[in-house]
Amino acid sequence: SIPWNLERIIPAWHQTEEDRSPDGSSQVEVYLLDTSIQGAHREIEGRVTITDFNSVPEEDGTRFHRQASKCDSHGTHLAGVVSGRDAGVAKGTSLHSLRVLNCQGKGTVSGTLIGLEFIRKSQLIQPSGPLVVLLPLAGGYSRILNAACRHLARTGVVLVAAAGNFRDDACLYSPASAPEVITVGATNAQDQPVTLGTLGTNFGRCVDLFAPGKDIIGASSDCSTCFMSQSGTSQAAAHVAGIVARMLSREPTLTLAELRQRLIHFSTKDVINMAWFPEDQQVLTPNLVATLPPSTHETGGQLLCRTVWSAHSGPTRTATATARCAPEEELLSCSSFSRSGRRRGDWIEAIGGQQVCKALNAFGGEGVYAVARCCLVPRANCSIHNTPAARAGLETHVHCHQKDHVLTGCSFHWEVEDLSVRRQPALRSRRQPGQCVGHQAASVYASCCHAPGLECKIKEHGISGPSEQVTVACEAGWTLTGCNVLPGASLTLGAYSVDNLCVARVHDTARADRTSGEATVAAAICCRSRPSAKASWVQ
Amino acid sequence: QDEDGDYEELMLALPSQEDGLADEAAHVATATFRRCSKEAWRLPGTYIVVLMEETQRLQIEQTAHRLQTRAARRGYVIKVLHIFYDLFPGFLVKMSSDLLGLALKLPHVEYIEEDSFVFAQ
């Protein structure tokens, strides 16, 4: 009788498997920044090191009574979820606990920073195998806490954080909002978002994925063999920390970018009922529940991509939104989305040596999002080709002219503010393979990449009748790298990728005044990586 | 994820009337003061002074010492609780909020963040 949460995240073929690194030893170490813990609990004894680190504020209230088992409750439970003998995700993993939360579960940003610095110092003094840091805590947005997470992540440490239990946008909290952290929301046994009293799991673009976080069985500090159930995004983050530890145990050289991409790729998709989230957050929140991925040896050199949303640009006339990929990832395409439809498009530009995806708001618009498609493409060489806007009534074409470069994405940016110009049907010639065809008065940007065995193709789907959205999916074995609304459509809200599905959204009011011949077309660029093959464009 | 969230950023580049010293007057603060948007979670009186990324070890200590010296001239006692070397250059300080304007004008300071609570989730 295995607890529901372990059944959910560990596929049947993994249940009895012991994850070991190639040399036979499991050298992954998990650092837990939480309350004190009961190291003598049978679930974790012998695999937990209680460091002498202690940086906590005093408990509130004059009548506060410190009871050891209560002080240890949160941390002991999480330690058990990560590496407990019976109810743990990564049963053999070594754990180090740092006390940054007091007996009431309160800590400070400064105490957490000192804890992170302690880990960095330990790493410098005695370099070891892969390190995973579990941050089952949240405070208000903190630039310095996010920066510290960034610095630690760049030393090769994998940080996993709770999204927060405030039923709010995770981007308003730290460390959940740090891009270098794997941020985890909580779901229940029915794969639905966790409700906690009047609140519940956080959501939004800063959440990477969800994991079990309701009624989770784990070590109880009440006695050395006791169990209890606890709920929260801490428990969800502990599951992912355990999964990451198991992944690193098998393959110690996996990087943060690879771990995140694989977690996303192999998660269970589309089981969460998105109606639980506020309407404006539904499109931004990933519909992903974590599961333990197979090893890279079992799955070959798949092309892995994820969608990264920017912050909302805000409503000012020249407001821009910027979406960034992780340093190791390639930005293969850039699109934009606006709820009002008033946007001036999107483009890719280099900032400080890194390609970023930008989107521009239009006059009267409520703001835009930039949507980046970030991929792991080994040995890739990517570049952007752009063409200025053509005269009204004409199309702009851009293609990848370098040898062995394939088109992975298209972006369109309108110089004019007048949206009506873009509502006239464009003169659409037969599309040539591997090229971007611009809307009228649009600058066109083509994202072109060369990588061993990379091949791409365009897949289009058009709908003439009234429809709020048009979708097109890449078939099995192919990965969506680019997603656009093609010229000829009515006023569109934009396009974005949801896993392997390209979604083109149309303005509600546009449905009524669309002429019968005018179709909204979603265009997906689908790519795959076949290491033995040459880079090619597939027609 | 990297844009600032619901966050208070205040420019405290206030020309101090009592700053008679040449080196203090010469340095105009471009650094910002930040604090948690949720008032109940703030910890006024404790501040994380974050220095520019390239700041050297010795400069971190000198900056902290300089803040203590200048505060003492104004009759304030400052307690440096911790110096950060390994993850980012900076220091944690217990001081009156009256000294924020002064601290923001110190060389090498990128921003100052008021300490705040974090909670078990």
Partner: antibody, heavy 118, light 108 residues
Framework: EVQLLESGGGLVQPGGSLRLSCKAS????????INWVRQAPGKGLEWIGR????????RYNEKFKGKATISRDNSKNTLYLQMNSLRAEDTAVYYC???????????WGQGTLVTVSS | EIVLTQSPATLSLSPGERATITCRAS??????LNWYQQKPGQAPRLLIY???NRATGIPARFSGSGSGTDFTLTISSLEPEDFAVYYC??????????FGGGTKVEIK
């Protein structure tokens, strides 16, 4: 050889009290917790409480709080169970048992019978 | 509070037969469950600890299995001295120690 030897049982009047002893030998006394368990005639096992001889810390079954008191004398390697306000339903064989590191009761005393009757 | 339910209450078997006793916990207890044997007029004796580990001096015919909430004690071939009462036990928070109601294995 590890041994636990109980004594102090016998006939007690209802409302009376008694003190049972458990003499330990053959191991480091302060290292292991000692539990008191009772068994009414023809019934199952019922846990009363435990003591950690190292620090004197005690833990009781809620049912016995106020009725049972467990103590120890480290100089004599002896544990005690004081029972007050005894009633007929307290008639049972009382055992002391050592809890090992794995939290199982690896050694038991032979038991001592307490009969509460007028 | 965890409740341990043992079944059957009585098991009537002949020597040489296989005995199977189950213990079901009302909550998850991992593998931290112990089994004891008690003969008439004697103190209980530890047989199995942590669900499946035989205590010192316990014959190989005794084995334990299970984890989570469902546990089994198996005596592969009953010897005359095995006819006794068997108890399962776990630790909990309140009360800290819980015993099952017992299973009597008697000669058929």
């Amino acid at each position: 050889e590890v041994q636990l030897l109980e004594s102090g049982g016998g006939l007690v009047q209802p409302g009376g009290s008694l003190r049972l002893s458990c003499k330990a030998s053959g191991y480091t006394f302060s290292r292991y917790g000692i539990n008191w368990v009772r068994q009414a005639p023809g019934k199952g096992l019922e846990w009363i409480g435990r003591i950690d001889p190292g620090n004197g810390g005690t833990r009781y079954n809620e049912k016995f709080k106020g009725k049972a008191t467990i103590s120890r004398d480290n100089s004599k390697n002896t544990l005690y169970l004081q029972m007050n306000s005894l009633r007929a339903e307290d008639t049972a064989v009382y055992y002391c048992a050592r809890a090992n590191d794995g939290y199982s009761f690896d050694y038991w005393g032979q038991g001592t019978l307490v009969t509460v009757s007028s | 509070e965890i409740v341990l339910t043992q079944s059957p209450a009585t098991l009537s078997l002949s020597p040489g037969e296989r005995a199977t006793i189950t213990c079901r916990a009302s909550q998850y207890v991992g593998s931290y469950l112990n089994w004891y044997q008690q003969k008439p007029g004697q103190a209980p004796r530890l047989l199995i600890y942590d669900a499946s580990n035989r205590a010192t001096g316990i014959p190989a015919r005794f084995s334990g299995s299970g984890s989570g909430t469902d546990f089994t004690l198996t005596i592969s071939s009953l010897e005359p001295e095995d006819f006794a009462v068997y108890y399962c036990q776990v630790w909990d928070s309140s009360p800290p120690v819980v015993f099952g109601g017992g299973t009597k294995v008697e000669i058929k």
